[in-house]
């Protein structure tokens, strides 16, 4: 999956950021999990949407809104529930 961060500049502890995790052309619909740098699940303020394209493959976008600490790592894990395959990506904000 790919990750984007907004705002992506001039961030200070206390800022609320929006982290978007995107994965494209999967089948079937994926499961998305978020966790912090210590592996603790992040379940609040998460919005996940999935959309099928003409081929019946799914694009997934999951958005996490989080208040930054002094520094932090945020990871997104996209799981194929049938194949039990995981793909993950993370962003570290210092």
């Amino acid at each position: 999956p790919s990750m984007t961060l907004e705002p992506n500049k001039d961030l200070r502890p206390g800022d609320t950021v929006t982290i978007t995790c995107s994965s494209y052309q999967g089948y079937p619909e994926a499961e998305v999990f978020w966790q912090d740098g210590q592996g603790v699940p992040l379940t609040g303020n998460v919005t996940t949407s999935q959309m099928a394209n003409e081929q019946g493959l799914f694009d997934v976008h999951s958005i996490l809104r989080v208040v930054l600490g002094a520094n932090g790592t945020y990871s997104c894990l996209v799981r194929n529930p049938v194949l039990q395959q995981d793909a993950h990506s993370s962003v570290t904000i210092t």
Epitope: E6, P7, D10, R12, G14, T16, T18
Partner: antibody, heavy 122, light 107 residues
Framework: QVQLVQSGAEVKKPGSSVKVSCKAS????????IYWVRQAPGQGLEWMGR????????YYAQKFQGRVTITADKSTSTAYMELSSLRSEDTAVYYC???????????????WGQGTTVTVSS | EIVMTQSPPTLSLSPGERVTLSCRAS??????VSWYQQKPGQAPRLLIY???NRYTGIPARFSGSGSGTDFTLTISSLQPEDFAVYYC?????????FGGGTKLEIK
Amino acid sequence: QVQLVQSGAEVKKPGSSVKVSCKASGYIFTADWIYWVRQAPGQGLEWMGRIYPGVDTTYYAQKFQGRVTITADKSTSTAYMELSSLRSEDTAVYYCARGGEVRRDFYALDYWGQGTTVTVSS
Amino acid sequence: EIVMTQSPPTLSLSPGERVTLSCRASENVGTYVSWYQQKPGQAPRLLIYGASNRYTGIPARFSGSGSGTDFTLTISSLQPEDFAVYYCGQRYSYPFTFGGGTKLEIK
């Protein structure tokens, strides 16, 4: 060129609200923070808060929490600062400023509006 | 909150003199300090960012230094247009704060 143009002077009664606008041009409005800073007569600069118009992320100084609201209209590239429950001590010049990336990973208030004088008087 | 203390509040000097303005932070702010110049009836103008970097178009007679808690702005040879109020400000942590300013006046 980058420009921040603010709305005109206001005279307000104690207890009322004021909304100051700041129209940006010459850069991508959604890609930089907008700050609000005020200056009481003969006094120094006081930071009030900031907004990132791209995703409407805001942060307010504790002193103004609950009384100030900073918003942005992406369609007109305009930021707003509304201050409520006005008192005489809020008489000041209110400035908006861009938090620009003046060099890679270096940020500062590089462009300022001309200031808006708000007078609170009964 | 981090308190930025500027000294002295006022300085009376003559054109051509060298001047050093001081700004002290109540706690470590790294190099997240900027300096601004303000003339009567005008908005502040950015001079120095990152404690020691001169902003575009600012004359070489202005220089900044420091890190941690102690910062200085030096004007090597005062010009008539330099008489103004100078503010330091930190954006290391919320709430961002400014010093009380140092007024440079002509002796």
